[in-house]
C-alpha cells in the first residue's frame, strides 16, 4: 500500500506557512482543490477551497488562508498567515473530482506553531509583520459537501517527536460557515487512483 508521509513545518506565532501542493497532472488543473485539517479519528475538515472550476493564478482567501492555483506548474500554493499556536496540526491538500472521492496529494503537512518571535527562516513574509497584505483580487469560494457511505480511515499515528493538535477548534476567522466534513481516502483507494503505481514515486512533495 502507498505510505502516507508527512513533512514537518515548525514556525512561530505571527509567521506565515507558505507551501505548494504538487498535483502534477494536467487533468487536475481545473479541478476544485481544498486545504484540509486532519484530526485523529475524525474525517478531514475542509478549511478553504478554490473556485469550481479552479481558476489559474487567482487567489482565494478564507480568513487567514489564501489558496492560489498555478495551472502551468501543477502547483497549489497554500498560505496560512499570522499563525497561531492553535493552528498546529496535520493538513493536506485534496482535489475534488465528483462523483469520485477526493484525490489526496502527497505529502501531508505537519504544522507546529510555537509562541514567541524568532528570526529563523520558515516564512516568505516578514516575521514581525502580523498583518498580511491580502492581494486585492482575492475571492471566496464555497466548498462542496461530499457524503460517502464508506467508513472513515483512521489518521496515521503521530510520531513522538510531533506536537499534538490542541483540542480547541482551529482559530480561523470566517471559516466555520464553509467547513465541511470530508472522507479521508484509504490507502487501498489510493492504489486505484488515476496515477498508476509506476508513477507514484515521482509524485512526492518537494
Amino acid at each position: 500500500a502507498t505510505k502516507l508521509t508527512e513533512e514537518k513545518y515548525e514556525l512561530k506565532e505571527g509567521q506565515t506557512l507558505d507551501v505548494a501542493c504538487d498535483y502534477t497532472l494536467e487533468k487536475f488543473a481545473s479541478s476544485q482543490k481544498a486545504w484540509q485539517i486532519i484530526r485523529d479519528g475524525e474525517m478531514p475538515k475542509t478549511l478553504a477551497c478554490t473556485e469550481r472550476p479552479s481558476k489559474n493564478s487567482h487567489p482565494v482567501q478564507v480568513g487567514r488562508i489564501i489558496l492560489e492555483d498555478y495551472h502551468d506548474h501543477g502547483l497549489l500554493r497554500v498560505r496560512m498567515v499570522n499563525l497561531q499556536v492553535e493552528d498546529s496540526g496535520l493538513y493536506q491538500c485534496v482535489i475534488y473530482q465528483p462523483p469520485k472521492e477526493p484525490h489526496m496529494l502527497f505529502d501531508r503537512i505537519r504544522l507546529v506553531v510555537t509562541k514567541g518571535f524568532s528570526g529563523t527562516p520558515g516564512s516568505n513574509e516578514n516575521s514581525t509583520q502580523n498583518v498580511y497584505k491580502i492581494p486585492p483580487t482575492t475571492t471566496k469560494a464555497l466548498c462542496p459537501l461530499y457524503t460517502s457511505p464508506r467508513t472513515v480511515t483512521q489518521a496515521p499515528p503521530k510520531s513522538t517527536a510531533d506536537v499534538s493538535t490542541p483540542d480547541s477548534e482551529i482559530n480561523l476567522t470566517n471559516v466555520t460557515d464553509i467547513i465541511r466534513e470530508q472522507k479521508l481516502i484509504s490507502e487501498e483507494d489510493l492504489e486505484q487512483k488515476l496515477i498508476s503505481e509506476e508513477d507514484l514515486h515521482h509524485h512526492h512533495h518537494h
Epitope: A20, L25, E26, A29, G74
Partner: antibody, heavy 121, light 111 residues
C-alpha cells in the same frame, strides 16, 4: 513497462518533409504531455517541442529553431505522438527522441531509442 | 529563453574520487520552493537517462552516489565516488519556462 518507439526517420532533401511517429505503451497515454528532443551527431541535446493533453486543449510549444516549420500532434486513440517536419534544413539532421514527462513541467523519465533524420542533397 | 551553462565542459576524475558538475541558469528556474531543473546521463549510442529531478530528487533505481543540489540559478550534480560505468556526458535541463532548454553537456572521463 513504459515503452516509446520512434519511427519514420530517413534521408530527405533540403526543403523536403518528413513525419515521425512515436508509439507509446505501458501507461495511460492521454494523461501525459509528449515531447520531442533531438541531437545532432557529436552535439548536445536540443528540446524541439511538446504537446499537452486534451485537458489543456492539446496546446503545443516549440523551440525557436523549428517554429513555423515543425508541428507536433497526437492521437490518443492510437497512443501515438507525431512530429511533422517541413522545410527541412541540413541543420535539422539529428537523432530525434520522443520523450514522456512525469506531469506538468516535470522531468523526462522515459525516452525512446531515437530515429535518425538526415537532411542532405 | 533561459540559457543553461554547464561547467566544466569536460572533466577527468580518478576512480573513487568525487566529481562535481555545475549548471548555471540565466534566470531563476524556481517556482515557489520547487526548482524545475533536472539532470540526465547519456552514454554513447543510448538515449539520455534521468538521474535527478527537480534539483535534488534521486530518480528511482539511480545509485545514491549521485546527488543534486541548488536552487534559483545555481545547481550542482555530484558523484561522490566515481565508478567506471559513470563515464558519460551529463546534461542539466530546465522545464520552468517554455522553451525548455538543456545545458551544453559535460563530458566525464576517468583520469
Amino acid at each position: 513497462e513504459v515503452q516509446l518507439v520512434e519511427s519514420g526517420g530517413g534521408l530527405v532533401q533540403p526543403g523536403g518533409s518528413l513525419k515521425l511517429s512515436c508509439a507509446a505503451s505501458g501507461f495511460t497515454f492521454s494523461t501525459y504531455a509528449m515531447h520531442w528532443v533531438r541531437q545532432a551527431s557529436g552535439k548536445g541535446l536540443e528540446w524541439v517541442g511538446r504537446i499537452r493533453t486534451k485537458s489543456s486543449n492539446y496546446a503545443t510549444y516549440y523551440a525557436a529553431s523549428v517554429k513555423g516549420r515543425f508541428t507536433i500532434s497526437r492521437d490518443d486513440s492510437k497512443n501515438t505522438a507525431y512530429l511533422q517536419m517541413n522545410s527541412l534544413k541540413t541543420e535539422d539532421t539529428a537523432v530525434y527522441y520522443c520523450t514522456r514527462d512525469m506531469g506538468i513541467r516535470r522531468q523526462f523519465a522515459y525516452w525512446g531509442q531515437g530515429t535518425l533524420v538526415t537532411v542532405s542533397s | 529563453d533561459i540559457v543553461l551553462t554547464q561547467s566544466p565542459d569536460s572533466l577527468a576524475v580518478s576512480l573513487g574520487e568525487r566529481a562535481t558538475i555545475n549548471c548555471r541558469a540565466s534566470e531563476s528556474v524556481d517556482t515557489f520552493d520547487y526548482s524545475f531543473l533536472h539532470w540526465y546521463q547519456q552514454k554513447p549510442g543510448q538515449p539520455p537517462k534521468l538521474l535527478i529531478y527537480r534539483a535534488s530528487n534521486l530518480e528511482s533505481g539511480v545509485p545514491d552516489r549521485f546527488s543534486g543540489s541548488g536552487s534559483g540559478t545555481d545547481f550542482t550534480l555530484t558523484i561522490s565516488s566515481l565508478q567506471a560505468e559513470d563515464v558519460a556526458v551529463y546534461y542539466c535541463q530546465q522545464s520552468n519556462e517554455d522553451p525548455y532548454t538543456f545545458g551544453q553537456g559535460t563530458k566525464l572521463e576517468i583520469k
